[in-house]
């Protein structure tokens, strides 16, 4: 598989890692969370070219179908291959706690 | 989050497994695999609408920003939760050897 | 649970260098918006806020102490270090570790009481 | 930097008694105060987060207000438990800044 920068459709068009600022209500979180008021949200986003970054035999097979029958099959997709913590403020009935949560953004990507 | 039948595009849309009958030429396997002929390759295929089978918290957030920021943020994307192992016959320089592949076959879906 | 153990010297003298180790569990100083703090408290005074150091290396520190201190992790090991130069006797203090989560001090340790003598 | 102020310093009140504690902030903090409660011989321990909401695990008893310079924290009714030193924090910027304290005695 290609490493992470070597993208054939030109650099920074393939599958990595993106942060996108949030706050609050752009996710929806202003009713249950205090703090963070902004969040530094990483993502993964970017095309996914043949054997670009493939997660697994899976995504390799993915991509041989998709270019067989690229009506049916999709191409893979560029999602989190594993996750960093964050840790939250919650509004709770009688006032705050901490959460952490281990599934909320993305540390590293690959194509599946 | 809906459940798989749930789809607000209409039955069958969203988020799921399908089943696509391919050869070993198909998949590029035909100089290395000797058996099956034939594979019911199992993939995750279809729209992951708002919340839709939603794997994470990630994938909650990317719903969000989506919606906010739809040409940046793509859709959350339809990929295997987990997989089902599947036996290979493959071809080596003294004759053949069964090799089990655990990230083959998509077994159930999610979006992320 | 979340727990933070302060180690340091005990006893130094005039001019030396105060090295101070906090061991943190149950919690990862990797974590988005998690941080450590440093705050010391004089006998029968109260708290000042010596340093800080967050999840992305980013670090804070007293303006008035800056110049003595310096903060650093190692994430590996789960241990947060402030460094105090050039110490003296109005150094003197129960130095404390604590977990800061977005600017509040959530959980404490129990403290390490350093000693500035000749 | 900005300075904190409490008062008042040392406060004596019966067990059953309303109690307030007073924080003045040298400028807008907004609602980015803390209040932390020392038992002798411990650490503080978190009391109140973002001027008003209480920490998970404090009793309903303490409750804090204010917001931009003038904050407060309240115990509804002091029980013998409660006698400590209370200082305020602000994090609205650094670097962070307590309050000098007020120590709490049961009369």
């Known amino acids: 598989a290609r490493n992470g920068d070597d993208c054939p459709l030109g650099p920074g068009r393939c599958c990595r890692l993106h942060t996108v600022r949030a706050s609050l209500e752009d996710l929806g979180w202003a009713d249950w969370v205090l703090s963070p008021r902004e969040v530094q949200v990483t993502m993964c986003i970017g095309a996914c070219p043949s054997q670009f970054r493939a997660a697994n035999m899976h995504a390799q097979i993915k991509t041989s179908l998709h270019r067989l029958k690229p009506d049916t099959v999709p191409a893979p997709c560029c999602v989190p291959a594993s996750y960093n913590p964050m840790v939250l403020i919650q509004k709770t009935d009688t006032g705050v706690s901490l959460q952490t949560y281990d599934d909320l953004l993305a540390k590293d990507c690959h194509c599946i | 989050a809906r459940n798989g039948d749930d789809c607000p595009l209409g039955p069958g849309r969203c988020c799921r497994l399908h089943t696509v009958r391919a050869s070993l030429e198909d998949l590029g396997w035909a100089d290395w695999v000797l058996s099956p002929r034939e594979v019911q390759v199992t993939m995750c295929i279809g729209a992951c609408p708002s919340q839709f089978r939603a794997a994470n918290m990630h994938a909650q957030i990317k719903t969000s920003l989506h919606r906010l920021k739809p040409d940046t943020v793509p859709a959350p994307c339809c990929v295997p939760a987990s997989y089902n192992p599947m036996v290979l016959i493959q071809k080596t320089d003294t004759g053949v050897s069964l090799q089990t592949y655990d990230d083959l076959l998509a077994k159930d879906c999610h979006c992320i | 649970q979340v727990q933070l153990q302060e180690s340091g010297p005990g006893l130094l003298k005039p001019s030396q260098t105060l090295s101070l180790t906090c061991t943190v569990s149950?919690?990862?100083?990797?974590?988005?918006?998690?941080?450590v703090g440093w705050i010391r408290q004089p006998a029968g005074k109260g708290l000042e806020w010596l340093a800080n150091?967050?999840?992305?290396?980013?670090?804070y520190y007293n303006s008035a102490l800056k110049s003595r201190l310096t903060i650093s992790k190692d994430t590996s090991k789960n241990q947060v270090s402030l460094k105090l130069s050039s110490v003296t006797a109005a150094d003197t203090a129960v130095y404390y570790c604590?977990?800061?989560?977005?600017?509040?001090?959530?959980?404490w340790g129990q403290g390490t009481l350093v000693t500035v003598s000749s | 930097d900005i300075q904190m102020t409490q008062s008042p310093s040392t406060l004596s009140a019966s067990v059953g008694d309303r109690v307030t504690i007073t924080c003045k902030a040298s400028q807008n903090v907004g609602t980015n105060v803390a209040w932390y409660q020392q038992k002798p011989g411990q650490p503080p321990k978190a009391l109140i987060y973002s001027a008003s909401y209480r920490y998970s695990g404090v009793p309903d008893r303490f409750s804090g207000s204010g917001s931009g310079t003038d904050f407060t924290l309240t115990i509804s009714s002091l029980q013998a438990e409660d006698v400590a030193v209370y200082y305020c924090q602000q994090y609205n910027s650094y670097p962070l800044t307590f309050g000098q304290g007020t120590k709490l005695e049961i009369k």
């Open positions: 150091i967050w999840w992305n290396d980013d670090k």
């Open positions: 604590a977990q800061e989560v977005y600017g509040w001090f959530a959980y």
């Open positions: 149950g919690f990862s100083l990797s974590t988005y918006g998690m941080g």
